[in-house]
């Protein structure tokens, strides 16, 4: 006869490990007992359990409640056991010793491998601002056994660097993603992808990039100066900019207070029916936590009685 077992048994943390030990005997041969022991500890073998043909399963105190026989139906030549709820410390070498009649004793050895799936974490780097050089966008760390693979999935151009820390029974892998921030990256996904044999599918953690910036400001509404004449209704100036975080707008008049009746509505300055007192230099002030911008325009309200048009100056300042 001979023993059938596996060289390696692989389970995921928390699963039950079946340790196989089947005696393939000739007809009439019987298995009297099967002793299971862990044998990679330097100070001696550690008994798991003893399966006795007459007296059943006897689990050692060290493995109380953790070793069972596989569910019925059971073959009397099958000395396999289940190690319940495998933990990382169970990883190691095991042997079964089978006492048979009349063929004598046989033994087999196997390695139990316990996969510890990683629980990845993604940490965003410092705030990204347009104009910075190469900056850490995010780091992703995953610890497991064996060491997990950590990669990045993104449309954003950048560079990655990885480092690994070995612990007694696991390894932690950290990957960093660096980039040169630009406004085009804003809102783009940066996904950390963790692969591991203990995972049914890759784990993905997505971080949305936020790049602080503030675009140059400009004012729209004076494209056709001839429309700015006394009595016109619905005249308005709109301040154009964009930024992250979204900017706030403030309107002032450089050569005095805003005329009465002029309405400020965020980025828009609304005028009542135009009069000459609305002529002047208007400043749009755009700001966010990152920066501020100004744009000023000169409004010259025309008197329709006059023939000659007047030049309009558009000045933009940062």
């Amino acid at each position: 006869g001979e023993l059938e077992t596996s060289d390696v048994v692989t389970v995921v943390l928390g699963q039950d490990a079946k340790l196989p030990c089947f005696y393939r005997g000739d007809s009439g041969e019987q298995v009297g007992q099967v002793a299971w022991a862990r044998v990679d500890a330097g100070e001696g073998a550690q008994e798991l359990a003893l399966l006795h043909s007459k007296y059943g399963l006897h689990v050692s105190p060290a493995y109380e409640g953790r070793v069972e026989q596989p569910p019925p139906p059971r073959n009397p030549l099958d000395g396999s056991v289940l190690l319940r709820n495998a933990v990382q410390a169970d990883e190691g070498e095991y042997e079964c010793r089978v006492s048979t009649f009349p063929a004598g004793s046989f033994q087999a050895r196997l390695r139990l491998r316990v996969l510890v799936p990683p629980l990845p974490s993604l940490n965003p780097g410092p705030a990204l601002e347009e104009g910075q050089g190469l900056t850490l966008a995010a780091s992703c760390t995953a610890e497991g056994s064996p060491a997990p693979s950590v990669t990045w999935d993104t449309e954003v151009k950048g560079t990655t660097s990885s480092r690994s820390f070995k612990h007694s029974r696991s390894a932690a892998v950290t990957s960093e993603f660096h980039l040169v921030p630009s406004r085009s990256m804003n809102g783009q996904p940066l996904t950390c992808v963790v692969s591991h044999p203990g995972l049914l599918q890759d784990q993905r953690i997505t971080h949305i990039l936020h790049v602080s910036f503030l675009a140059e400001a400009s004012v729209r509404g004076l494209e056709d100066q001839n429309l700015w004449h006394i009595g016109r209704e619905g005249a308005m100036l709109k301040c154009l900019s964009e930024g992250q975080p979204p900017p706030s707008y403030n309107w002032t008049r450089l050569d005095g207070p805003l005329p009465s009746g002029v309405r400020v509505d965020g980025d828009t300055l609304g005028f009542p029916p135009l009069t000459t007192e609305h002529s002047g230099i208007y400043v749009c002030h755009v700001s966010n936590e990152f920066s501020s911008r100004d744009s000023q325009v000169t409004v010259d309200v025309l008197d329709p009685q006059e023939d000659s048009g007047k030049q309009v100056d558009l000045v933009s300042a940062s």
């Epitope: 009297g32 007992q33 002793a35 022991a37 044998v39 990679d40 500890a41 100070e43 001696g44 073998a45 550690q46 008994e47 003893l50 006795h52 006897h58 689990v59 050692s60 105190p61 060290a62 109380e64 070498e93 042997e95 010793r97 006492s99 004598g104 004793s105 033994q107 050895r109």
Partner: antibody
């Protein structure tokens, strides 16, 4: 310090029973098998059986099945061996021993049982 | 059951000389990992004391003059140099399977 303290010598009549105790101290009682060994006068050592202090599960040498009954009292960290239907062949020194990874690293001092009319 | 045969049953060795005790098992008690054979010393009126476990591993506190060797079925306990205090009976024991058994013992006398 691991200690196994056995009960004192016993003189019993043939056909009677005797219960020997083995009180463990200096370690977690439920973490190790307790074995019992017989040594007849001038003779060698015979393994009687073992008990798992966690649950009281026992395994016996077939020769002593029905003769010896092994039990434990977890609350007092004490193992017991009862010997039944005693005959002169049962006169011997009986030892309890704690198993450490398949070897008997700690032994009680022994209990002499004398069966005599 | 596995039968352990010890020889000699008794021996007398001069102080400082070598004592050699043999133990033969009726079947192998070794795997690729461990040999399930142990040696005990018993002095009169005392319980046995573990000397060597797994055929060759000296138990903590035991003098290095005690040396165990062997695997499979043939095992040897050597004591060299013997000292007066080594007067005792020595037993081999296997823990390969149930029932565990002991050898018949070897009584060592120091001349």
């Amino acid at each position: 310090e691991v200690q196994l303290q056995q009960s004192g010598p016993d003189l019993v009549k043939p056909g009677a029973s005797v219960k020997i105790s083995c009180k463990a101290s200096g370690y977690s009682f439920t973490d190790y098998y307790m074995h019992w060994v017989k040594q007849s006068r001038g003779k060698g050592l015979e393994w009687i059986g073992r008990v798992n202090p966690n649950n009281g599960n026992t395994l016996y040498n077939q020769k002593f099945r029905g003769k010896a009954i092994l039990t434990v009292d977890k609350s007092s960290s004490t193992a017991y061996m009862e010997l039944r239907s005693l005959t002169s062949d049962d006169s011997a020194v009986y030892y309890c021993a704690r198993e450490d990874r398949y070897a008997f690293a700690y032994w009680g001092q022994g209990t002499l049982v004398t069966v005599s009319a | 059951d596995i039968v352990l045969t010890q020889s000699p049953a008794s021996l007398a060795v001069s102080l400082g000389q070598r004592a050699t005790i043999s133990c033969r098992a009726s079947q192998s008690v070794s795997t690729s990992s461990y040999t399930y054979m142990h040696w005990y010393q018993q002095k009169p009126g005392q319980p046995p004391k573990l000397l060597i476990k797994y055929a060759s591993n000296l138990e903590s506190g035991v003098p290095a003059r005690f040396i165990g060797s062997g695997s499979g079925t043939d095992f040897t306990l050597n004591i060299h140099p013997v000292e007066e205090e080594d007067t005792a009976t020595y037993y081999c024991q296997h823990t390969w399977e149930i029932p565990y058994t002991f050898g018949g013992g070897t009584k060592l006398e120091i001349k």
